[in-house]
């Protein structure tokens, strides 16, 4: 049943009109071709629609000759260009990603059937739902000019100005499927910028084709003010390469998009070369600016740098006579001020006001290098005091009342001797487990210790054990980091193993062998030798994402995510950088909850002496990465099953 009435009209085109109608009790779209439309065009579209069955392609339900028409499934949410123009607010990052993923899936399917689509644009992408984890969100429609392609390619100029590849627009040049990849790059650009380019194109239609043909598309983030999306921006650049051969194939585009890392990596900032960052701290989440303080430097000087994440503005100042090894932010809510405390290799504790950098002084000097700092938060609700805890290379724990950091030369309230020169106090950590809010843990030499707000040592666990056998050599190494929830996770110097200790029984209850997990990934990709892997699997940093995942950063630049509830691997982010240095969770203004990961990249410099130039790189990750890995895997699995079902049905 259908009526060619204006209220049922869904759209017009040069071929004819599309109406909303009913077919076998279902709402459908009926494409009525103009009387003068050649039968060849209808046949061409029919051939394509009849032979292709895929979750990303609009399905043909029926066809008629008098009048010439096609009955197709109806997309309840309309076209992507309508969404870009009228409902931008619905376009969350995950939805943007899923739309792109579904279109790429359809495109690679068409290309595998040797078909060039030739008219990929937001108008031809139809939406079925805006729920980001639905199996079917977006489909490609309108096969009017899709064409089978021989190996050599085709020559006719088709497509829509402003949405086509330069080789198509020029005309009279042979082109192939890579032209669609260019159009996909433009589509991705339009999704990222929520259609900003299209609005301008409507104002200046003559120039619409010119900009992208000449590769002069403005920077999406700077020009349209959209939030950075590093891996998508990179993919857009690759798809918009002038030379079709330099563009990825549609299958490669799909593989790139089929990645939770692509969705969740929200920022990638390269710091100036040879700024070697040792530590970082994020400003308090109540502050206006999403900003980070970085402790850097070489043996004879310490630099404190400030990075504004909104503007990516970077300032740096030499503040100490030796390397800054650790940083802490002390927030004093009553005074409405915050202070950055820098611990240096020479034992100096330098305190700088975050609002007024001229307000600065030092606290009483420590007896050895300051190896860790922690400002605890025992008294979020209660009237208890808060403290700045200072660990030193000679195994001492100095306790300052937080308020005293304002005072020049302030002395600690108490100093505990936990270790000695050969057993440095390398780390301090608060438990994420809500049942022990007032318990702090630390690592000193090979011992783990705990204490509460009265600063008496409650537990002292010796972690030296021959149980590791395969990794026995690392058991005697000093602990470099401890993170705590229901269990204790500890990493030791140069060890590729994270030891898991039971707090109650004080026994080792498991080992997380990074080499094994890395090997599982690399065996498939045949990447590294065993010895190399043991070296690149050295654990450098740990970070606990409450009730979700343990993030492990390695010396070889890999990040491992481990599910806390099952102790199973969620994901290895392989070769993320040359070496991961620091990982921490933060609440940063509008960025909400994020994971900050700082790593080093080493580049060989030009010239005769092959010196390695180090560049620090800060990345900001959406904290939902572990969930997104699982969601995306499920999503892809469901779509695979759907595609297989459709393929089987078409064969039958």
């Amino acid at each position: 049943e259908f009526e060619q009435a204006p209220e049922f009209l869904l759209g017009d085109g040069s071929f004819g009109s599309v109406y909303r109608a009913a077919y076998e009790g279902e709402e459908v779209a009926v494409k009525i071709f103009n009387k003068h439309t050649s039968l060849r065009l209808l046949r061409q579209e029919l051939v394509v629609l009849c032979h292709l069955h895929h979750p990303s392609l609009i399905s043909l339900l029926a066809a008629g000759i008098r009048p010439r028409m096609l009955v197709m499934e109806l997309a309840s949410k309309g076209s992507l260009d309508r969404l870009l123009q009228q409902d931008k607010a619905s376009l969350t990052r995950t939805l943007q990603h899923r739309i792109a993923l579904h279109v790429a899936d359809g495109l690679r399917y068409l290309h595998s059937a040797m078909i060039i689509y030739r008219d990929l644009k937001p108008h031809n992408v139809l939406l079925f739902t805006l729920y980001p984890n639905a199996a079917i969100i977006a489909k490609i429609a309108d096969y009017g000019i899709a064409q089978y392609c021989c190996r050599m390619g085709i020559k006719t100029s088709e497509g829509t100005p402003g949405f086509r590849a330069p080789e198509v627009a020029r005309g009279n040049v042979i082109y192939n499927q890579q032209a669609d990849v260019y159009s996909f790059g433009l589509l991705l650009y339009d999704i990222l910028t929520t259609g900003g380019r299209i609005v301008e194109g409507l104002k200046f239609p003559n120039e619409f084709d010119e900009l992208e043909i000449q590769g002069k598309l403005p920077d999406p983030v700077k020009e349209y003010g959209c939030a950075p999306w590093p891996m998508v921006e990179k993919l857009i650049k690759q798809c918009l390469k002038e030379n079709p051969q330099e563009r990825p194939t549609s299958a490669q585009v799909f593989d790139i998009l089929n990645s939770a890392e692509l969705v969740c990596l929200t920022r990638r900032i390269l710091l100036p070369k040879n700024v070697i960052v040792e530590c970082m701290v994020a400003t308090h989440h109540n502050s206006r600016n999403a900003s980070i303080w970085l402790g850097c430097g070489h043996t004879d000087r310490g630099q404190l740098s400030f990075l504004d994440l909104n503007t990516e503005g970077y300032t740096s100042e030499e503040v100490a006579d030796s390397r800054i090894l650790c940083l802490a932010l002390v927030h004093l809510p009553v005074e409405k001020e915050s202070w950055i405390v820098s611990g240096t290799q020479s034992g100096t504790l330098l305190v700088i006001n975050t609002e007024d950098g001229k307000k600065r002084h030092t606290l009483e000097k420590m007896t050895d290098s300051v190896t860790c700092l922690y400002c605890n938060s025992f008294s979020k609700q209660s009237k208890q005091k808060n403290f700045l805890l200072v660990g030193t290379a000679d195994g001492k724990l100095a306790i300052f009342e937080d308020k005293t950091v304002k005072l020049k030369g302030a002395a600690p309230l108490k100093i505990l001797n936990i270790g000695n020169v050969s057993t440095p106090l390398m780390c301090l950590s608060e438990s994420t487990n809500s049942t022990e809010r007032n318990v702090m843990w630390g690592g000193c030499g090979t011992k783990i210790f705990s204490f509460s707000n009265d600063f008496t040592i409650q537990k002292l666990i010796e972690t030296r054990t021959s149980q590791l056998f395969s990794y026995a050599a690392f058991s005697d190494s000093n602990i470099i980091t401890v993170v705590v929830d229901t269990a204790l996770y500890i990493a030791k110097q140069n060890s590729p193993v994270v030891e898991v200790w039971d707090k109650k029984t004080e026994k080792l209850c498991g080992l997380i062998d990074c080499v094994h997990f890395l090997r599982e990934v690399t065996v498939k990709e045949n990447k590294e030798s065993k010895h190399k892997m043991s070296y690149s699997g050295r654990v450098k940093t740990l970070c606990l994402q409450k009730n979700t995942a343990l993030w492990i950063g390695t010396g070889g630049g890999h990040i491992l995510l481990l599910d806390l509830s099952t102790r199973r691997l969620i994901r290895v982010i392989y070769n993320f950088c040359n070496s991961v240095r620091v990982m921490m969770t933060a609440q940063l203004g509008s960025l909400k909850n994020v994971m900050l990961v700082l790593g080093y990249n080493r580049k060989n410099t030009e010239g005769t002496q092959k010196q390695k130039e180090i560049q620090s790189c800060l990345t900001v990750w959406d904290i939902n990465l572990p969930h997104e890995v699982q969601n995306l895997e499920k999503h892809i699995e469901v779509r695979k099953e759907l595609a297989e079902k459709m393929r089987r049905t078409s064969v039958e």
Partner: nanobody, 125 residues
């Protein structure tokens, strides 16, 4: 369904030896860690040794290191525990266990996915 069947237990004099076997079936075990645990009367179950099915990395409790050796035969889908220089305190029910957690090696029973029914080892003085 994964099945683990232990054998080789028995009565032995202090200083003697025993070899326990654990036959595994119902799965491809390449990604598994296989372990031996023991439970003495009135005591908690404790870790003895573990081995990676692929790669063969081994792990031992301090109390058995140097006396016990864990090994596996991939062709037979079997894991062995060679126990030498046995002591009366080694008396316990020995359980074979399997865990499919890749690079996570459980040294506490709570993280093992499958268990055998156990075999009794008694060391007399």
């Amino acid at each position: 369904q994964v099945q683990l069947v232990e054998s080789g237990g028995g009565l032995v004099q202090a200083g003697g030896s025993l070899r326990l076997s654990c036959a595994a079936s119902g799965r491809t075990f390449s990604s598994y860690t296989m372990g031996w645990f023991r439970q003495a009367p009135g005591k908690e179950r404790e870790f003895v040794a573990a081995i990676r099915w692929s790669g063969g990395s081994t792990y031992y409790a301090d109390s058995v290191k140097g006396r016990f050796t864990i090994s596996r035969d991939n062709a037979k889908n079997t894991v062995y525990l060679q126990m030498n220089s046995l002591k009366p305190e080694d008396t316990a029910v020995y359980y074979c266990a399997a865990s499919d957690r890749g690079g996570f090696i459980a040294t506490s029973g709570g993280w093992m996915d499958y268990w055998g029914k156990g075999t009794q080892v008694t060391v007399s003085s």
